[in-house]
């Protein structure tokens, strides 16, 4: 039959070449002389000349060694023709299968592999996968079947078999318990890939396994007991820095400390924060401490981490004994601002009030007093008793020193501590009005015509307060009523001055007496310029000159 079974040829053959592989034979050769030829890739097309055929015998020849990894199968066609070149057979399929030799070593896809696994994980936890390839056949032979193994582990702590590698997948897993980042933070494994399923050629690579941190170490106070001294009243004062050690990875949430005051801070006087770099607990005063109330505080502070513990761990507690140091505290006026009502104009030497301070310190310290600010110089203060007396005339109507009836004085108290301290108080004297000012007309100069004169309206002002003001009364004195009249309007706050008899042009004094509701009388002289004119005038007209 004009058929040939697939031909198997091992790669890397030694020869000699050409090497006879198989004979093509047509049974038509009994009738006529047959000539054989082959075509196809490897014969007459690239790669040309790998195979040939003996023209007359039909022997298929191999001309050189084959490489399965280059071409694993050749598909050729065999031809048979008679002497005259006519085909005597249909072209025949010739399959040449190149069989594998173990001529390649495995190759890792990387020279160094990197992976990581959390410390403390259970055996069986997968870490990473490594891969090696082998160009040889792994389907029909074991030449390309790679088996993985761990050649060595560095370091060998806690023992030399912390990891295993799946021989066929290359998956590296934890095989032993005891991965502890704080003892061994990284392992270097020398891994092997061996073909022939572990019985052939070997290649090596490195697998670096980083052990990742878990919060398996509690922060511990070192030391656990502290003594601190804090001056009383200091707010935001650094009391103590508490130091902790934590074996977990620095600057990670498993290392960063969180502090909590567990006890001893009944008045909420303290606060504790974590220093971002040193991880220390910084204990500070949130409120001022009072030596006289409590001179020692014993605080209990617990430390944990930002991250939760991965297992049950005992927490560390520190004890801080805070000694409050006595400070010479300033005397405090009671109240800090004192309002006292006092009549204006009280006699010199008259007592105004007693204004004293208390010293928070427990010792019987002597307090002395003095006036710190008395703008008008109206007051004096007894240095021992704090008695404030008038030494000048308190004038409610003094606009330079009195605002809204209040005269403000600052007083000082000084103790005899070492060094002495001072406190200030504010004395607000509310000056009660006295009818010490009579009414005053405005304006006090008028110009009026001596013919058909216009009535002159004068406003009445009184520096005192009601009821020592309107309604006002007016009266002309010193014979001024011969030529003038003075009447207060219905509201009682203006006076109307009228010329009732002819006066020649000149300047005259009008004696006007005004009294207020409390009968406080004030005599005012009005300068009246009388002009030769009719009705309304502002200035007297000059003398008329004819031409």
């Amino acid at each position: 039959d004009w058929v040939v079974a697939p031909i198997s040829v091992p790669e890397n053959g030694k020869g000699p070449f050409p090497q006879r592989l198989n004979q093509l034979k047509s049974n038509k050769d009994r009738d006529t002389k047959i000539f054989y030829s082959i075509t196809g890739p490897g014969a007459d097309s690239p790669p040309e000349g790998v195979f040939a055929v003996e023209k007359e015998t039909g022997w298929l020849l191999l001309n050189k060694p084959l490489d399965r990894e280059e071409i694993a199968k050749y598909e050729l066609f065999g031809h048979a023709v008679s002497e005259n070149g006519a085909s005597v057979e249909d072209p025949m399929n010739i399959s040449i299968i190149v069989t594998d030799q173990n001529d390649h070593k495995p190759k890792f896809t990387q020279d160094t592999f990197r992976g990581s696994v959390l410390e403390g994980v259970l055996p069986g936890t997968s870490v990473m996968q490594v891969t090696a390839t082998d160009e040889d056949d792994a389907i029909y032979t074991y030449n390309g079947v790679v088996a993985y193994s761990i050649h060595s582990q560095e370091p060998k702590d806690p023992h030399d078999l912390m990891f295993t590698i799946h021989r066929s997948t290359g998956t590296i897993s934890v095989i032993s318990s005891g991965l502890d980042r704080e003892k061994v933070p990284e392992y270097t494994l020398t891994i092997q890939a061996t073909d022939m399923d572990g019985d052939g050629s070997t290649t090596t690579a490195v697998a670096v396994v980083e052990i990742l941190d878990a919060n398996d170490n509690a922060p511990m106070f070192d030391p656990q007991k502290y003594e601190a001294h804090v001056p009383e009243n200091a707010v935001g004062h650094e009391v103590q820095r508490l130091t902790v050690t934590d074996l977990d990875a620095p600057n990670s949430p498993a290392w960063r400390a969180t502090y909590l005051i567990m006890g001893g801070d009944d008045g909420d006087h303290f606060t504790i924060t974590t220093h971002p770099e040193s991880n220390q607990g910084i204990l500070t005063t949130r409120k001022g401490l009072d030596f006289e109330a409590k001179n020692q505080h014993t605080l209990y502070v617990e430390v944990t981490n930002e991250a939760p513990f991965v297992l049950k761990l005992p927490t560390s507690t520190a004890t801080i004994v805070v000694h409050v140091e006595d400070v010479n505290e300033a005397p405090v006026f009671v109240p800090p601002s004192k309002v006292v009502e006092v009549q204006e104009g009280i006699p010199t030497g008259e007592p105004v009030c007693v204004y004293t301070a208390e010293d928070p310190d427990k010792e019987n310290q002597k307090i002395s007093y003095r006036i710190l600010r008395d703008p008008a110089g109206w007051l004096a203060m007894d240095p021992d008793s704090g008695q404030v007396t008038a030494v000048g005339t308190l004038d409610r109507e003094d606009e330079q020193f009195v605002r809204n009836n209040i005269y403000e004085v600052m007083v000082l108290a000084m103790d005899n501590g070492s060094p002495p301290t001072t406190g200030t108080g504010t004395l607000l004297l509310t000056l009660i009005d006295v009818n010490d000012h009579g009414p005053v007309p405005e304006p006090r100069q008028i110009t009026i015509c001596n013919q058909s004169p216009v009535r002159q309206v004068l406003n009445i002002t009184d520096k005192d307060l009601s009821p020592h003001t309107s309604p006002f009364q007016a009266q002309l004195t010193d014979d001024s009523d011969i030529y003038w009249t003075a009447e207060v309007n219905e509201e009682g706050d203006t006076v109307v001055l009228s010329l009732k008899k002819f006066l020649k042009q000149d300047t005259y004094d009008v004696h006007l007496s005004l009294s207020d509701h409390g009968n406080k009388e004030q005599l005012t002289v009005i300068r009246a310029t009388v002009c030769d004119c009719h009705g309304h005038v502002e200035t007297c007209p000059g003398p008329w000159k004819g031409g």
Partner: antibody, heavy 123, light 113 residues
Framework: EVQLLESGGGLVQPGGSLRLSCAAS????????INWVRQAPGKGLEWLSV???????NYASSVKGRFTISRDNSKNTLYLQMNSLRAEDTAVYYC?????????????????WGQGTLVTVSS | DIVMTQSPDSLAVSLGERATINCKSS????????????LAWYQQKPGQPPKLLIY???TRESGVPDRFSGSGSGTDFTLTISSVQAEDVAVYYC?????????FGQGTKLEIK
């Protein structure tokens, strides 16, 4: 002060052997990986081998199977046993300390180097 | 093996001028987990051993003048000398330590113009 001092270099015939030493001082020798690096005359640097703290090793393919790195922590000394020497092995051989213990702290960078010892392979 | 290629092979720079040396790796030296580039730079003066200048591609070794700086990531890296001094005449090498075997660039010779 960290110091590394190589010795053992010299003239050797092709196929011959030589053992280089590197005496270390000024640091905790046992705590650091140590490397051998060579430099052929007028050429660049070629890394040869490392020995890690636990004694594990790694080699460049050019010397694998011919050179062996070892250390004696009790003597603070590093060694390089060189067999089957070839003309192309002629170079100045340096020992160099890794700046870190672990891969993640940069053990591949070498922060201290010895002055080197010259090995000449010639017939 | 990872191949390291430096450019240029040599360069001449005037005193006080900037010098830039490039280094290219055949594969990435960036490890994604820690975002670090496993690359170092060395200086070797005539007759002396190499001296470490930069590690992690940009971290200056203690005692190295701040005119030396490293930059780059992945496969492309640069050593810059901001103001070249006479004492900077040397051969500069980059080295990868991402993967064994560690490999160096062929070196760049710096001269004064």
């Amino acid at each position: 002060e960290v110091q590394l001092l190589e010795s053992g270099g010299g003239l050797v015939q092709p196929g011959g052997s030589l053992r280089l030493s590197c005496a270390a001082s000024g640091f905790s020798f046992s705590s650091y990986p140590i490397n051998w690096v060579r430099q052929a005359p007028g050429k660049g640097l070629e890394w040869l081998s490392v020995i890690w703290t636990g004694g594990g090793t790694n080699y460049a393919s050019s010397v694998k199977g011919r050179f062996t790195i070892s250390r004696d922590n009790s003597k603070n000394t590093l060694y390089l046993q060189m067999n089957s020497l070839r003309a192309e092995d002629t170079a100045v051989y340096y020992c160099a300390k890794s700046r870190g213990v672990y891969d993640f702290d940069g053990r591949g960078a070498m922060d201290y180097w010895g002055q080197g010892t010259l090995v000449t392979v010639s017939s | 093996d990872i191949v390291m290629t430096q450019s240029p092979d040599s360069l001449a720079v005037s005193l006080g001028e900037r010098a830039t040396i490039n280094c290219k790796s055949s594969q990435s030296l960036l490890y994604s987990s820690n975002q670090k580039n496993y690359l170092a730079w060395y200086q070797q003066k005539p007759g002396q051993p190499p001296k470490l200048l930069i590690y992690w591609a940009s971290t200056r070794e203690s005692g190295v003048p701040d005119r030396f700086s490293g930059s780059g990531s992945g496969t492309d890296f640069t050593l810059t000398i901001s103001s070249v001094q006479a004492e900077d005449v040397a051969v500069y090498y980059c080295q990868q330590y991402y993967s064994y075997p560690y490999t160096f660039g062929q070196g760049t010779k710096l001269e004064i113009k």
